[in-house]
Each structure stands twice: as structure tokens, then as C-alpha cells.
Amino acid sequence: QAAPFPELCSYTWEAVDTKNNVLYKINICGSVDIVQCGPSSAVCMHLLKTRTYHSVGDSVLRSATRSLLEFNTTVSCDQQGTNHRVQSSIAFLCGKTLGTPEFVTATECVHYFEWRTTAACKKDIFKANKEVPCYVFDEELRKHDLNPLIKLSGAYLVDDSDPDTSLFINVCRDIDTLRDPGSQLRACPPGTAACLVRGHQAFDVGQPRDGLKVVRKDRLVLSYVREEAGKLDFCDGHSPAVTITFVCPSERREGTIPKLTAKSNCRYEIEWITEYACHRDYLESKTCSLSGEQQDVSIDLTPLAQSGGSSYISDGKEYLFYLNVCGETEIQFCNKKQAAVCQVKKSDTSQVKAAGRYHNQTLRYSDGDLTLIYFGGDECSSGFQRMSVINFECNKTAGNDGKGTPVFTGEVDCTYFFTWDTEYACVHHHHHH
């Protein structure tokens, strides 16, 4: 039986049940390399409290559909008096990066995971030439996730004092230049995640090979190497390589530019101070507020919730968008879709799509950007579920009693972008460091 998601096969992935202090290792095509789980375990559960291991999914007992992967075991479990077997169930959804398996819940018998990944899309539009896992768990099992930094198009310029060269990088995947045929970036070879431009020539100085690593709690490392043989003539016989160290700052700050800290014989060392390197709970909340000692800030968008069936309306040329954020009030137009953002076609108001649902909500404050994300909307033809990204700006003089109003800014591959100027986005910082 062929592997259902070949792009995910090269790595052993991790997921965590934080509530119960459980680390899962997942290898969807072969087996995880953990002796205590046996030679054919595809899903190995490590109970950190008791320091014990159990296989909760056997690679031999795999069954797959386009969107669901199940690994059974021969271990019995008692669920309401019936004799079941322990199993793991991974639900796959289309995403724009390789993504990460997320632990959902576990019963006596079944361990449930969800994975939004390019590997599950119906079309290849989001697939990279080369991409590696872009998250890591630290020793306290806290997740550090750089997926939001991955550019699907374009690159980051590395700050370098050399006026004759430009070093471009992407995070965890190769650079896609197709959307910008006119720039210097266009000359970069396919597959490169680190591209050095000198004059009119561009050179591959590194491709992703291994996933993100944690060196200590607040420092993450990504290494790129040039896969091709054939040395570059300006590298003095050495093979090019790039090391990017992502550093979580000691207190809240605006984002910074990746900086070249050392360069020798085509070995490039880059340091990037960014809050995306911090653990995810520092940056994100499933509610509409971020506060407390853990986050160093106080943000509360709940006053933006609309009551009494009214919604914010944002004009998107062909479409009208109805938004009801930070609540669970049904949008009247949206046919009981549990939508936080609802897209209605102006020329045919019966064409209604959920562009993100209110129970799929993430509030993120990172590198000075405050963003509210709604995902899990109606599917597009690619298989990607529509989602909405609302970028908030602090405006103490916003109209509508300080609430302001969302403005639709555009759509990229079934992701809808809005900006929203409001006094409720004015962030209060706690300086307790």
C-alpha cells in the first residue's frame, strides 16, 4: 500500500497533550524509532509523569482515506463494556504549509489528532519544492511554531553590511519568486531557501534538509545546505551552508530584521530576534483576550462583539463581508454556518460562504502585530477551507464609539484579509522582566 501523504514521510513528527503531560511521536509512513514502543509503532505515546511508553498505533495496521489516517493496535481497551482496540486517528485538512499535527483529545481507546497540511490539498498550488517541519517542543513541552513566518511567495532580506550582495532567505521552505517576475529575486535557482545575489547572478547557498531544532528554551536553529555537488568559485572550495538562529526576546518588542552575524567561506550565520521563536502560549489565545503574566500584555477585543443579530459589514467589490467577532452570535445571512466571517456575493445573494468560523478562532500578538484569525470556513476548489485574517491597528480616535470598522484588503488563495483600526487594539504592556 503506497504511503498516503509522501511529503510527510521523511520525518518523525511530534504532538503534545499538555493537560496530561504526554508527548506523541508520529511517523505516518514507517515506524518511530523508539525501542520501548516496539519495532512497528507509527504512533508512540510517552507519558512523561510515569516515564513510560505505549504504542497507540501500529504502522502495519494502517487504514487510509483522502482525509483520514487510522492506526490500530492489537491492545484491548474497555470502552463502555465493549471490547475495542487502542487506535490513533489523524484527520487531515488542506493547509498552506506542511503544518503540524495537533493533539485534539483522547478517550480510553482512541487518540485523535488534526493536521492542516499541504499534503492534504486537492491541488498542488501550495506545495513547496522543499519544506521541512517548522516547529519544535522545548523541554517543558511548550510549542515553538515558526509556520507563521513561512513565506508562500517571496523572501526576507537579510541585513548585511556588504553593498555588493543581497542574501535572501525563506523559513523552512524554498523561495517562490513566481509572483514577482521583475525583481532581482527572480534569478534565484528553484529549491533554494537561501539565495545570494551578486550583480545579475543568483546562487543557491542553502536548501532545507532537517527540521527546526531547539538549542535551548529561547533559541531555535534552522540549517540549510547546498545539496548540489559542484562548488561555487567564490567559496574557496567549501560547500555553502546557512544557519539561522531564531531568538525569543526577553521582553515584548517590535519585530526585527534577520541579521548576518558571521560569514566565512560561504558559511553564513544569521540571527533573527523574533517573538515567533517564543512558545506559542506567549503569543496566542483561543479567546479574544491576551492577558496575564504569561503574555506580558493586556489585550481585550471582546467589546468588538456585536449583539442583537447585527454585524460589521465590509465591502469587497464583488462581495460583501459580514463579520461578527469575539462571540458566538449567528450572522443572519450565513445560513447557520457558525461563521464569524461570512462572504455574500453581491450579484447573487444566495451565494453565501463561511470565511471562518467562530469556534476556530486564534488571537495572536507577535512582533508588534495584533491579528485575529478565523479558520475552518467553507472549502475552496483546492480543498483549503476559507479563512480570514484581521490585522488590528491601535486608533484611539476610531469612530463607532472607539470600535472602528473592518476594511477588506484583499484575498490570497481563499484567505481573506482585513484591517481594523480600533481603540481596543491599543496594547497595554506589563514590564515585569
Partner: nanobody
Framework: QVQLQESGGGLVQAGGSLRLSCEAS????????WGWFRQAPGKEREFVAA????????SYADSVKGRFTISRDNAKNTIYLQMNSLKPEDTAVYYC????????????????WGQGTQVTVSS
Amino acid sequence: QVQLQESGGGLVQAGGSLRLSCEASGRTFNTYNWGWFRQAPGKEREFVAAIRWSSSKTSYADSVKGRFTISRDNAKNTIYLQMNSLKPEDTAVYYCAASIVDFTTNPSHFGSWGQGTQVTVSS
């Protein structure tokens, strides 16, 4: 690829103000970072100001800091450059440009350009 069209240039006295506009069409507004550049006769094209697509973060050339303001109206797919306290040395053709590179002010990293609009500041 995105298409850009500048407007708003003209002749103004030193100390005066102008507001340049740049309307974008074609590819989506949302995947690009935006910049204003200028080129005076016989000189290289130089960076003036930039704004990131994903937020309203801005950067400015030292020579215009405090006098020029870059902004955008996403609903209209338009970038603006508000120029106050203009000086004769601000005389140039002003170009709007779009880039898929984050954190850059280098004109060669901008793949889409407008035709430019002339700004002349008389003393």
C-alpha cells in the same frame, strides 16, 4: 504581476505640500510590500519610504523623516505619500513600487514599478 499608476505630482514652492497617490491593479494588493522611490536628473534612483503589506509598519530615508508620510487605503488599493515642508532638493520623478521581499529598501528588490510622477520644488 501588479500594475501601478502614480498621480499627484506637480510644481510647488519650497515649504509647500503635495500628496502623491499610487493605485494598484492586477495581482492582489495583499502579497506585496510597497515603496516610494525618487530619481533626480543624473542621479541614481533612491529609496524614500516603504510600508509592509501585513501591517502598517513603515520605514523612511533619513532625508525625508519627519516631513514625508507613507500610508495606504486598502479598500482603494492605493498607496499615498504625503510630502510636507518640501525643499528644492526633493525635486525628482517619484516612483511607486511593489516587492515580495520583506525588509528591503533596495530598488532592485522591487519587481513592479509605476511610470513615475514629476515633483518640482521651486525656491
